[in-house]
């Protein structure tokens, strides 16, 4: 004969464990139903009765099958710097990831705490290393032969034109100026072509958020602008 | 856009009951309150009760837990407020309100209110 | 019950003046729970600061709310005409959910 299907609460076999989705209670030392996700214990089970489960409360949620007497609070809603990438529901905490232009300068556990804005190169000066979801842009002086003439978090040194005849010699940060009305561009060493850098915006990691005051402001942390590496510009 | 379109003024004799509706527009019914917030002539707010649309699930303050019925109907997104044996007291602005779930009760978007008036 | 006390009840202040609104509560509210409305006469209150600090998009910057605890602050840094309404805290922290009893503000 097969085996009497048990139903919770029971006593576990000597030795024995709880099956799954279940979970023993050392008071009423039964093995008990676990709660589902997006609900939590209203009522512990005792020796004749199972677990009493009730839906999370507004901005509260669980994610797992568990017996937490209260569910966890979802975090703080996304400060400015920040997009919601994740909505806080009964199942599922808020996620925050930096937005466009920005990175993690401050990352926790899961995710992120602080958002920064992409450092940006100052005229005679390229990114030499773009700007990923949790690092800054890197900026380096343009070499000769090379320019930029824009405050950019994300344009390289370009290689500045050949003329038939140079009106305006080109520097780190201005084009040449040339007479002929064809010019051409050359492959000055150093002109290198990055490729352009990635979105800080994560669609595959799950941090969990930061608890955020007023928007664009850091939780307890007083984190204060670094101040700017040679060639970027705080703006 | 988000739009709470309440029923229209009402005038009631004691000890009779009324029903208020709220209908929502712009928006999924689904992860969302909706809140009945009562205002008396010249006096401040009082929160009365709330519904989840997509459950049913309700929860009063325990002075209304007897006067007030909450229910809706998510088919017409339409949430409800029904009041029994009416007093002079309950002469008021009755609005509803929304919240997001995950937005810790903040109401973003209230109905333009209904006075309920309780004369003889 | 968590009871919510505003002060004053009233004011009257001209334009410009900077403005301070307190919100005492009988027990503490988490920052993410308290929230405050602005309601003017004949009109549905409109939320105007959420979770202590934050303006929803369309708010004037120059409303601002602090505090944690039991004591929270709403500050109009420079007092406008159409800010003339009546001003609500709300504890969405422990139901019953409670609002307070609201200050009156008047434009001299």
């Known amino acids: 004969l097969p085996a009497q299907v048990a139903f919770t609460p029971y006593a576990p076999e000597p030795g024995g464990t709880c099956r799954l989705r279940e979970y023993y209670d050392q008071t009423a030392q039964m093995c008990c139903s676990k709660c589902p996700p997006g609900q939590h214990a209203k009522v512990f089970c005792t020796k004749t009765s199972d677990t009493v489960c009730d839906s999370c409360e507004d901005s509260t949620y669980t994610q797992l099958w568990n017996w937490v007497p209260e569910c966890l609070s979802c975090g703080s809603r996304c400060s400015s710097d920040q997009v919601e990438t994740q909505a806080c529901t009964r199942e599922q905490n808020r996620i925050c990831t930096c937005r466009p232009g920005w990175y993690c300068a401050l990352s926790k556990q899961e995710g992120c705490r602080l958002c920064a804005q992409l450092r940006k190169c100052r005229p005679g000066f390229g990114v030499a290393r773009p700007g990923t979801e949790t690092s800054d842009v890197v900026c380096k002086p343009c070499a000769p032969g090379t320019f930029s003439n824009t405050t950019s978090s994300t344009d390289i040194c370009r290689p500045h034109q050949i003329c038939h005849v140079v009106a305006i010699p080109g520097n780190a940060s201005m084009d040449a100026v040339c007479t002929s009305t064809s010019p051409t561009r050359s492959m000055a060493p150093g002109a290198v072509h990055l490729p352009q850098p990635v979105s800080t915006r994560s669609q595959h990691t799950q941090p969990t958020p930061a608890p955020s005051t007023a928007p664009g402001t850091s939780f307890l942390l007083p984190v204060g602008p670094s101040p700017p590496a040679e060639g970027s510009t705080g703006d | 856009q988000v739009q709470l379109v309440q029923s229209g003024s009402e005038l009631k004799k004691p000890g009779a009951s009324v029903k208020v509706s709220c209908k929502a527009s712009?928006?999924?019914?689904?992860?969302?309150?909706m809140h009945w917030v009562r205002q008396a002539p010249g006096q401040g707010l009082e929160w009365m009760g709330r519904i989840d649309p997509a459950t049913g699930n309700t929860k009063h303050d325990p002075k209304f837990q007897d006067k007030a019925v909450l229910s809706s109907d998510t088919s017409v997104s339409t949430a409800y407020l029904q009041i029994s044996s009416l007093k002079a007291e309950d002469t008021a602005v009755y609005y509803c309100a929304r919240s997001p779930y995950g937005d810790f009760g903040a109401m973003d978007y209230w109905g333009q209110g209904t006075l309920v008036t309780v004369s003889s | 019950d968590i009871q919510m006390t505003q002060s004053p009840s009233s004011l009257s202040a001209s334009v410009g003046d900077r403005v301070t609104i307190t919100c005492t509560a009988s027990s503490s509210v988490s920052s993410n729970y308290l929230h405050w409305y602005q309601q003017k006469p004949g009109k549905a209150p409109k939320l105007l600061i959420y979770?202590?600090?934050n303006l929803p998009s369309g708010v004037p910057s120059r409303f601002s709310g602090s505090g944690s605890g039991t004591d929270f602050t709403l500050t109009i840094s420079s007092l406008q005409a159409e800010d003339a309404a009546t001003y609500y805290c709300h504890q969405y922290h422990r139901s019953p959910w409670t609002f307070g009893q609201g200050t009156k503000v008047e434009i001299k």
């Open positions: 979770s202590t600090s």
């Open positions: 712009g928006f999924n019914n689904k992860d969302i309150y």
